[in-house]
């Protein structure tokens, strides 16, 4: 059977400062069971951008409604983009673990570049 794939269709996205950036991500399956999180950067120093379960992410909204059944769309939108937001964003599927979830598969990443705000 086909294993879950994490699809980030855009390799890069360019957004003007002050605008919102939409970072797209889709899963091909509902299983294995476990959460999806967004990070900027890779490796040990990566920054958590969005985790629905815990944390406060006031600039991040999910593209699909949080109450949508059997959702496979895990795209997010980040508002009020600044140059400091530039970087590569990864959509990551975790496999449910006890007590800790285990990283299962990552998308290829989407590089966000920030253009100067039009004068």
């Amino acid at each position: 059977e086909d294993e879950l794939q994490v699809i980030q269709p855009e390799k890069s996205v360019s957004v003007a400062a002050g605008e919102s950036a939409t970072l797209r991500c889709a899963m091909t399956s509902l299983i294995p069971v476990g959460p999806i999180m967004w990070f900027r950067g890779a490796g040990a120093g990566r920054e958590l951008i969005y985790n629905q379960k815990e944390g406060h992410f006031p600039r991040v909204t999910t593209v699909s409604e949080l109450t949508k059944r059997n959702n496979l769309d895990f795209s997010i939108s980040i508002s009020n983009i600044t140059p400091a937001d530039a970087g590569t964003y990864y959509c990551v599927k975790f496999r449910k673990g006890s007590p800790d979830d285990v990283e299962f598969k990552s998308g290829a990443g989407t590089e966000l570049s920030v253009r100067a705000k039009p004068s």
Partner: antibody, heavy 119, light 108 residues
């Protein structure tokens, strides 16, 4: 959606049983599946859940019960070993459903199969 | 493990009346809570998920509310088929998935 459990019966303490759940009416391989049990006159108790290769168990059955699935047969199984009197219950098979970024609840249930552990 | 406490254990209501009962979680489960109905001799049936969303086909007289640790299921104008046991279930933090002990709604 239809879920039909079978394999229940009367077994002596220390014995084994294998429960089956035949699923139809949905794309079985795309969903996690769960066993929930109900002791006589008692409430509902989660037993085990399976995603793709990922399996999860209640502490009360860990090491004794094994959940598995055969996607080619649209069938869920629960192998129950070292059975105890406290395992006596109606065992329900349930289809998992998710809400967007959250965990699982159970949107379809079978009618259950009764397991009695008694000498 | 998150413990769900349902109250009251038994609720006696006359047909046509309103029934309200609660489910309290031992810790915050956000909106990750479902409600099930179980009629005598039958399997449980999903009524509500995400604390407040009615499952397809569930009558409008059933409504869920609350978030965090306090949740309520309300049945307006009880019908004869509504006399059953009602369970809440959290899916915020698992394993294990946990259920409340149930509220039995009986005819007054």
């Amino acid at each position: 959606v239809q879920l039909v459990e079978s394999g229940g019966g009367v077994v002596q303490p220390g014995g084994s049983l294998r429960l089956s759940c035949a699923a139809s009416g949905f794309s079985f391989s795309n969903f996690a599946m769960t066993w929930v049990r109900q002791a006589p006159g008692e409430g509902l108790e989660w037993v085990s859940t399976i995603g793709s290769g990922d399996t999860y168990y209640a502490d009360s059955v860990k090491g004794r019960f094994t959940i598995s699935r055969d996607n080619s047969k649209n069938t869920l199984y629960l192998q129950m070993n070292s059975l105890r009197a406290e395992d006596t219950a109606v065992y329900y098979c349930a289809k998992d459903s998710t809400v967007s970024w959250s965990g699982d609840f159970f949107d379809y249930w079978g009618l259950g199969t009764r397991v009695t552990v008694s000498s | 493990e998150i413990v769900l406490t349902q109250s009251p254990a038994t609720l006696s209501v006359s047909p046509g009346e309103r029934a309200t009962f609660s489910c309290r979680a031992s810790q915050n489960v956000k909106n990750d809570l479902a409600w099930y109905q179980q009629r005598p001799g039958q399997a449980p049936r999903l009524l509500i998920y995400a604390a407040r969303i009615r499952e397809t086909g569930i009558p409008e007289r059933f409504s869920g509310s609350g978030s965090g640790t306090e949740f309520t299921l309300t049945i307006t104008s009880l019908q004869s088929e509504d006399f059953a046991v009602y369970y809440c279930q959290q899916y915020y933090d698992w394993p294990p998935f946990t259920f409340g002990g149930g509220t039995k709604v009986e005819i007054k």
